[in-house]
Interface confidence: low
C-alpha cells in the first residue's frame, strides 16, 4: 500500500488541475482567537462560523465576536455580524442548532454583570436573527425539545429551571433549586432539586422530579438521589443507601413511575457509575473500582436494565480527567473499542464484535512490525489512541472515526505492540469493522470520511511547519493522491466536513500570521470535478458482515442474525451521492446458547456455554435479594441477549425456579426502595455519576 502517488495510484494522477478549479479560499479579516462551526440543516449547504477573540483586562474580559454565513458548504462566507448587532457571543455555549431540519439557531450573548441575558434566534437557517431578552443568566446551552423545536429548556446560574414554548420570546420559571434537567420523550422533563444548601451539599439527598405537561404539574419520582440519566428507553438514578454512604443504581422503563434495583455493585463516595452507551435494547455501564485506580468494570444489561453481566475487567476510565476510550464503531453493528489498564500499568486496546459478549485484542496489521513495547516481535496487537491519549497531550490529532453510512470503515491512530506506545503514532484503517487492520498513513493525520466512504481525505499533522497539502483516496485508503491546495502554507487547525459523511466538500481551517496580526483562513475543496461519474449497480459488491469462517453455516451471525451489504468496490471511482442509502439484507440465524445470557442467580462456568445455578448468593446478588422486586426473582436461568433476533435452534427452556427461598438471610429486609421513601441522606461530595451516553459530562 502506498502513502504517496506511485505506479499503483496512477488513477489519481492529474488531479491537481481538476481540484484547483474547485478550491475556494476565504480570508476572515478579524483577530484570530477561536472559531466554532455549525452546519444548519442537512444538505442545505449552510454553515455558520463564529469567531471570538477575548482579552482579559484586570477583573473583566473584553471580547469581540464575528458571525459568518455560508450557503455553499463553505466555499464563500458573508460577514453577518450586523445580524447580531455586533454583540459578543459566548463561545462556551457554542451555536445551538435545532433538531432535525428545523432551521433554528440560538446564539447566547455575553452580558457581563447583568441579572439577565440575551439570545439571538433564527428560524430561517441563520438568514435573519431576532434578539430576545432573558430574565435569567443561562448556566449552560439552552436545549431544544427533541420533538418540538419551539420549546426550549434552560437552567440559570441561580439554579432556576426556565421554559419557553414560543422559541425564546416568552419564558416561565418552572422550578427553583434545580441541579440537572433533561428532556425525556414527548413533553417530559426530568430534573433534580436540592432542599438545603446547594447541589453539591445535597448530593445524595436530591429529589428527582418529572413533569409530563411542560410544567403544569409535577411529580416526585425519586428521593435520596445522587444523580440521574437517560439512556435509550431507560431512566437511571443512583440512590443513596439507608445504612451507609454507598449508593446504587435504580432503573425505570416507565418514565419513573416504578423503579427496579439494578443488579450492580454499589459504589462509595469516591467511585462513580457511567453509562458508556445505551440503546432501546440494553446499556453498557461502567462501575468504577474502589481507590484511585483509573479503571473499573464494564457490565452489560439485559432487556430490562436490571440484570447485568460482567463484560470487561480493568476498563480504563480515569477519575481525575473523566477520560475513557470507549468508542462505538458506528460502521458495523455490535462493535465497540475501548482500553484496559493492565497490571503493569500499560494501556491495551480491546474490541468486541458482539455488543460486549467477548472482548479480544485487535489483530496485528499485516504491513506493520511490532514496536518496542512487544516482548515477542512476531506476536503483538494493534492498540488504538482515543480520548485518553488526546487528554495526555500525545501527538494524536483525532479520535477514532467511523460513520454508519460508510459500512465497515474505521480509521484511527495507533501503534503495534503489547500496549499503547507514547511514540509518534501512525494511522490505521479497517474495512471490515475492526476485524482486520492496515497501516494507512505514516505519522499523525487529521482525517475525514466523505461521500459515504467513497472518498477519504487526510492532512498531515505538522505543528511546527505550515500545511499546503491534502491527501485523498478513492479506494478506502490503499492509494493516496496528493493535492497542493495553496502555494503559501497555513498553520492548520482542522478539517471540517458536513456531519453525516455524505458531502463531496471538505474545508481546511487554519490561520496565517503576518508581522502584525493573525487571521483565520479556510480552503474548501469540492471533489465533484475529480469524481464525476455516479455509481451504478456494477460498482457495488456483496459483503457479509462479521464473516470469519465462510465454511460455517452460521458465519456472520451476531446477535441472532447476519447481514449482507452492498458495498462500493475499492476499484470503482464514482460518487455514491448525497441520496445514497446503505443496502443491507438481514437473515435470521438459529439460536444457540451464545444467544442467551444467564439470568439472576445463574452463572456460566469457565469454557461452558450453559447457565448453572449459583450454589449460594453473595455480594451484590444478595443485595439484589434484599432490595430487588419479587417478580424478578423467578427465572428459568436464561434470558435472550437484548436485540438478539435468533429463532429456532436451541431453546434453553427449563422449569421456572423461585429464587426467593435463596434470599433468606439474617438481615432485616428493608422497606422496598421506591420514589416515595423517606430517610436521612447518606454522604455528600465525591464524584458525579456520568449518565450520558457520548460522555457529555455534567459538572457542578
Amino acid at each position: 500500500r502506498s502513502t504517496e502517488q506511485g505506479e499503483s495510484c496512477s488513477g489519481l494522477l492529474g488531479a491537481d488541475a481538476k481540484l484547483a478549479g474547485n478550491t475556494h479560499q476565504h480570508i476572515f479579516n478579524d483577530l484570530s482567537g477561536s472559531v466554532s462551526l455549525a452546519w444548519v440543516g442537512d444538505g442545505t449547504g449552510v454553515i455558520l462560523a463564529l469567531t471570538t477573540f477575548q482579552v482579559p483586562i484586570f477583573m473583566i474580559t473584553i471580547g469581540q465576536s464575528k458571525l459568518y454565513r455560508s450557503e455553499d458548504y463553505g466555499k464563500s462566507f458573508e460577514d453577518v455580524t450586523n445580524l447580531i448587532n455586533n454583540t459578543f457571543i459566548r463561545s462556551d455555549f457554542g451555536i445551538a442548532i435545532g433538531p432535525e431540519n428545523s432551521g433554528k439557531v440560538i446564539l447566547t450573548a455575553d452580558v457581563s454583570g447583568s441579572h439577565g441575558s440575551r439570545i439571538f434566534v433564527s428560524s430561517d437557517f441563520g438568514k435573519s436573527f431576532t434578539h430576545q431578552e432573558l430574565p435569567f443568566v443561562p448556566l449552560m446551552q439552552i436545549t431544544y425539545n427533541p420533538e418540538n423545536s419551539n420549546v426550549l429548556l434552560a437552567l440559570s446560574n441561580k439554579n432556576e429551571l426556565w421554559l419557553s414554548e414560543d422559541f425564546g420570546t416568552n419564558w416561565k420559571k418552572l422550578y427553583d433549586a434545580v441541579c440537572l434537567a433533561k428532556w425525556g420523550s414527548d413533553n417530559t422533563i426530568f430534573f433534580t432539586t436540592y432542599a438545603n444548601g446547594s447541589c453539591k451539599a445535597d448530593l445524595g439527598a436530591l429529589e428527582l422530579w418529572r413533569t409530563s405537561d411542560l410544567g403544569k404539574s409535577f411529580k416526585t419520582i425519586g428521593v435520596k438521589i445522587y444523580s440521574f440519566g437517560l439512556g435509550g428507553r431507560f431512566l437511571f438514578a443512583s440512590v443513596m443507601a439507608d445504612k451507609d454512604t454507598t449508593r446504587r443504581i435504580h432503573v425505570s422503563t416507565d418514565q419513573g413511575d416504578t423503579w427496579s434495583m439494578a443488579q450492580l455493585p454499589s459504589v462509595g463516595q469516591e467511585q462513580f457509575y457511567s453509562i458508556l452507551a445505551a440503546n432501546d435494547d440494553m446499556v453498557f455501564m461502567h462501575v468504577d473500582e474502589p481507590g484511585d485506580t483509573g479503571f473499573g468494570t464494564i457490565f452489560t444489561s439485559d432487556d430490562r436494565g436490571i440484570v447485568y453481566s460482567k463484560s470487561l475487567d480493568r476498563h480504563l476510565y480515569t477519575t481525575t480527567g473523566g477520560e475513557t476510550d470507549f468508542t462505538n464503531v458506528t460502521s458495523l453493528r455490535g462493535v465497540y473499542i475501548t482500553s484496559v489498564l493492565s497490571e503493569d500499568n500499560s494501556i491495551q486496546t480491546m474490541i468486541t464484535f458482539d455488543q460486549g459478549g467477548r472482548w479480544t485484542h485487535l489483530r496485528k496489521p499485516e504491513n506493520s512490525e511490532c514496536d518496542a513495547t512487544a516482548k515477542n516481535k512476531n506476536e503483538c496487537s494493534l492498540h488504538i489512541h482515543a480520548s485518553y491519549s488526546i487528554s495526555q497531550k500525545l501527538n494524536v490529532p483525532m479520535a477514532p472515526l467511523s460513520e454508519p453510512n460508510a459500512v465497515g470503515i474505521v480509521i484511527a491512530h495507533g501503534s503495534v505492540g503489547d500496549a499503547i506506545s507514547v511514540m509518534v503514532p501512525d494511522v490505521y484503517i479497517s474495512d471490515d469493522g475492526g476485524y482486520s487492520w492496515t497501516k494507512m498513513l505514516e505519522g499523525p493525520h487529521h482525517y475525514a470520511i466523505l461521500d459515504s466512504g467513497g472518498l477519504l481525505v487526510a492532512v498531515e499533522q505538522n505543528a511546527h511547519q505550515g500545511v499546503n497539502q491534502i491527501k485523498f483516496s478513492t479506494d478506502e485508503g490503499q492509494c493516496w493522491g496528493v493535492y497542493n491546495f495553496t502555494k503559501d502554507p497555513i498553520f492548520f487547525t482542522g478539517l471540517a466536513s458536513e456531519p453525516g459523511a455524505r458531502s463531496m466538500n471538505v474545508s481546511l481551517w487554519g490561520y496565517r500570521s503576518s508581522l502584525f496580526h493573525q487571521y483565520w483562513i479556510s480552503f474548501t475543496i469540492d471533489f465533484r470535478d475529480l469524481i464525476t461519474r455516479n455509481c451504478e449497480e456494477k460498482d457495488y459488491t456483496i459483503w457479509l458482515a462479521h464473516s470469519t469462517d465462510p465454511e460455517d453455516y452460521e458465519d456472520g451471525c451476531i446477535l441472532g442474525y447476519k447481514e449482507q451489504f452492498l458495498r462500493l468496490r475499492k476499484s470503482s471511482v464514482c460518487q455514491n451521492g448525497r441520496d445514497y442509502v446503505v443496502t443491507k439484507q438481514p437473515s435470521i440465524c438459529l439460536c444457540s446458547l451464545e444467544d442467551f445470557l444467564c439470568d439472576f442467580g445463574y452463572y456460566r462456568p469457565e469454557n461452558d456455554s450453559k447457565c448453572v445455578e449459583q450454589p449460594e448468593l453473595k455480594g451484590h446478588d444478595l443485595e439484589f435479594c434484599l432490595y430487588g422486586r419479587e417478580e424478578h426473582l423467578t427465572t428459568n436461568g436464561y434470558r435472550k441477549i437484548p436485540g438478539d433476533k435468533c429463532q429456532g435452534g436451541v431453546n434453553p427452556v427449563r422449569e421456572v425456579k423461585d429464587l426467593k427461598k435463596k434470599c433468606t438471610s439474617n438481615f432485616l429486609s428493608p422497606e422496598k426502595q421506591n420514589s416515595k421513601s423517606n430517610g436521612s441522606a447518606g454522604g455528600s461530595g465525591g464524584l458525579n455519576d456520568i449518565f450520558e451516553a457520548q460522555k457529555i459530562e455534567w459538572h457542578e
Epitope: 469516591e270 477519575t319 481525575t320 506506545s421
Partner: antibody
Framework: EVQLLESGGGLVQPGGSLRLSCAAS????????MNWVRQAPGKGLEWVSA????????YYADSVKGRFTISRDNSKNTLYLQMSSLRAEDTAVYYC??????????????WGQGTTVTVSS | EIVLTQSPGTLSLSPGERATLSCRAS???????LAWYQQKPGQAPRLLIY???SRATGIPDRFSGSGSGTDFTLTISRLEPEDFAVYYC??????????FGQGTKLEIK
C-alpha cells in the same frame, strides 16, 4: 510557576521518627501522582514511595516498606512522608517529585530542591 | 527486579563534541517507560527525556534519546559547557515501581 518545596528534614537518632512535608503550587495538585526520591551522600538516586492523585493508592520501595508512610492533603496541596524506625542508611537528601498520568509514563517532570535527613547517634 | 546499568561510569569530553551515554536493562523494558535525567552538583535532577525519545518541555534539541528492549542511548549532539553533569536513566512499571541507573558522570576533558 510550578513549584515543590520540601521541609521537615534534620538530624535524628537511629530508631527515631521524622515527618517530611512538600508544599506544591502552580498546578492542580490532586490531578497528579507524587513521589519521594532520595539520594544518599555521593550516591545515585533511589525511589522511595509514590501516591496517586486522590491518595487512594500508595506504593513503597522494599527498603522502606512498613517503616515509611506516604500521604497527601489535597485541600492543602501538601505531600507528606512519615518516617519511623529510621536507620543510618536512610541518611539522604529527600526529593519530592511530580509524576504524570495513568498508563503513560512521562517521567518525573517537577522536582523540589530537596531536604536533608541525617540519621546518626 | 530490573537493574539498569549505565556506561561509561565517567565520560570525559570537550565542549562541541558529541556525547553518547548508554543504559542497559537486565530485562526488556517498554520504551514508553524509560526516562533520562540530568543532575548538576547541589541541584535537583531535571527531566530530559521520557518515553525513551520524547524531549521534556524546554529541553534543547541537542538532547535526543533512542533505543528499545534492553538498550537505550542518550545523545548530546554538540556539548555546551552547561551540559557537564551526572546523567541518570530510569525505568518505570515493574516492581519496584521505579529504578534508576547508577549514573554517568560527564566531565570536561
Amino acid at each position: 510557576e510550578v513549584q515543590l518545596l520540601e521541609s521537615g528534614g534534620g538530624l535524628v537518632q537511629p530508631g527515631g521518627s521524622l515527618r517530611l512535608s512538600c508544599a506544591a503550587s502552580g498546578f492542580t495538585f490532586s490531578s497528579y501522582a507524587m513521589n519521594w526520591v532520595r539520594q544518599a551522600p555521593g550516591k545515585g538516586l533511589e525511589w522511595v514511595s509514590a501516591i496517586s492523585g486522590s491518595g487512594g493508592s500508595t506504593y513503597y520501595a522494599d527498603s522502606v516498606k512498613g517503616r515509611f508512610t506516604i500521604s497527601r492533603d489535597n485541600s492543602k496541596n501538601t505531600l507528606y512522608l512519615q518516617m519511623s524506625s529510621l536507620r543510618a542508611e536512610d541518611t539522604a537528601v529527600y526529593y519530592c517529585t511530580r509524576g504524570r498520568g495513568i498508563g503513560y509514563y512521562n517521567g518525573m517532570d517537577v522536582w523540589g530542591q530537596g531536604t536533608t535527613v541525617t540519621v546518626s547517634s | 527486579e530490573i537493574v539498569l546499568t549505565q556506561s561509561p561510569g565517567t565520560l570525559s569530553l570537550s565542549p562541541g563534541e558529541r556525547a553518547t551515554l548508554s543504559c542497559r536493562a537486565s530485562q526488556s523494558v517498554s520504551s514508553s517507560y524509560l526516562a533520562w535525567y540530568q543532575q548538576k552538583p547541589g541541584q535537583a535532577p531535571r527531566l530530559l527525556i521520557y518515553g525513551a525519545s520524547s524531549r521534556a518541555t524546554g529541553i534543547p534539541d541537542r538532547f535526543s534519546g533512542s533505543g528499545s528492549g534492553t538498550d537505550f542511548t542518550l545523545t548530546i549532539s554538540r556539548l555546551e559547557p552547561e551540559d557537564f553533569a551526572v546523567y541518570y536513566c530510569q525505568q518505570y512499571g515493574s516492581s519496584p515501581m521505579y529504578t534508576f541507573g547508577q549514573g554517568t558522570k560527564l566531565e570536561i576533558k
